[in-house]
């Protein structure tokens, strides 16, 4: 079938392949201090690491990309590590009349894959 | 709001930023010649190019990633160019008894963004 099995063990060694990592960021880092009140610091999960051949392939396209990258590395880039899902986050932000709570669905990564 | 405006003009010069590019691939290239009969060659649209700050940001997470990459380039990778949507593709493949047409929804990229 079109779907070769994406592999889950990292051939590059521990922590080198595509995975979720927590990055601490302040409102100042994000440029949000003028409109967000809370939280003052965000634990941002982000996708980092390399995508060796067929590691955590997002889909058939990613598998093809991995294969063609092996054949034509100058023309076809390797798949890269991006979020596969997100954790919703609530921000408390200023409004014209006061404060409001708003949920953001695409702010913090929950899982990663190679696309 | 959390969404800064993703920009669409490439600051790196024509063809350098994240875009869709066609790559010709044979069934042999893909390792599919034993089970796919048609097409013998696929025009594969793939996402290639760089993702400079806020260029075609997929979502808020990608905008945060771009900003934090500017602050901590060793810790946070730049966003990378991945498919935002796909064009369905029909493959004619061998079955035990003959041939069958099957649609694959995630094989050829139709659009790209920076995630």
């Amino acid at each position: 079938s079109a779907h070769a099995h994406p592999r889950d063990s990292c051939p590059l060694g521990p922590g080198r392949c595509c995975h979720l990592e927590t990055v601490q960021a302040t409102l100042e880092d994000l440029g949000w201090s003028d409109w967000v009140l809370s939280p003052r610091q965000l634990q941002l999960s982000m996708c980092v690491g390399e995508c060796p051949h067929l590691y955590r392939s997002a889909n058939t396209h990613a598998q093809i990309k991995a294969r063609l990258h092996g054949l034509q590395p100058d023309k076809v880039p390797a798949p890269c590590c991006v979020p596969s899902s997100y954790t919703p986050v609530v921000l408390m932000h200023r409004t014209d009349s006061g404060v409001s709570l708003q949920t953001y669905d695409d702010l913090v990564a929950r899982g990663c894959h190679c696309a | 709001s959390a969404h800064a405006h993703p920009r669409d003009s490439c600051p790196l010069g024509p063809g350098r930023c994240c875009h869709l590019e066609t790559v010709q691939a044979t069934l042999e290239d893909l390792g599919w010649s034993d089970w796919v009969l048609s097409p013998r060659q696929l025009q594969l649209s793939m996402c290639v190019g760089e993702c400079p700050h806020l260029y075609r940001s997929a979502n808020t997470h990608a905008q945060i990633k771009a900003r934090l990459h500017g602050l901590q380039p060793d810790k946070v990778p730049a966003p990378c160019c991945v498919p935002s949507s796909y064009t369905p593709v029909v493959l004619m493949h061998r079955t035990d008894s003959g041939v069958s047409l099957q649609t694959y929804d995630d094989l050829v990229a139709r659009g790209c963004h920076c995630a």
Partner: antibody, heavy 118, light 107 residues
Framework: QVTLKESGPGILQPSQTLSLTCSFS??????????VGWIRQPSGKGLEWLAH???????YFNTALKSRLTISKDTSNNQVFLKIASVDTADSATYYC??????????WGQGTSVTVSS | DIVMTQSHKFMSTSVGDRVSITCKAS??????VAWYQQKPGQSPKFLIY???YRYTGVPDRFTGSGSGTDFTFTISSVQAEDLAVYYC?????????FGGGTKLEIK
Amino acid sequence: QVTLKESGPGILQPSQTLSLTCSFSGFSLSTYGIGVGWIRQPSGKGLEWLAHIWWNNNKYFNTALKSRLTISKDTSNNQVFLKIASVDTADSATYYCARMGYDIMDYWGQGTSVTVSS
Amino acid sequence: DIVMTQSHKFMSTSVGDRVSITCKASQDVNTAVAWYQQKPGQSPKFLIYSSSYRYTGVPDRFTGSGSGTDFTFTISSVQAEDLAVYYCQQHYSTPWTFGGGTKLEIK
């Protein structure tokens, strides 16, 4: 479930233009590798391929009829159109449309009967 | 254009018999020949692709063979419901062309 249905004028006069519509469901003409073809069959005779149009808008025509044929598609409304200019009695036939996956015509409509008569 | 010739317009057979229908191409078409079945009052049904590949759901009593210019479609054990006209069609190059058809009659 794939279905195709042809519609046409039924009867028309010589020298007029025949306009046929193929309305389909169960597949999309924006899918790579998919096309829709037209085939006709005069009463009691064999099949004659007329034209087909692909997902990427590439078009192919029967050599003998090419100058009289126009094929087009409306992808969003799942329709394909065939026009035959300057018809005469020899164009009387049942007209079929068929879904194509590469060079397979795997699903056919029920056909629409066209009579050219003065 | 490639001309496809089915030399027999009619073939008569009995239920349970094996029957073969032939088709000849005017030039080499490799294995690019399809076969269709058209029952009375119905639209054609796709059976065989690229000379020998049965399409999904087609009973295994239907087989095809051949390459180059000579092709054969075989029903290993004819059933009453196989009464139909059978057409070959080349898909080697456009314009696609059909044979004239062979009508299978059940004795």
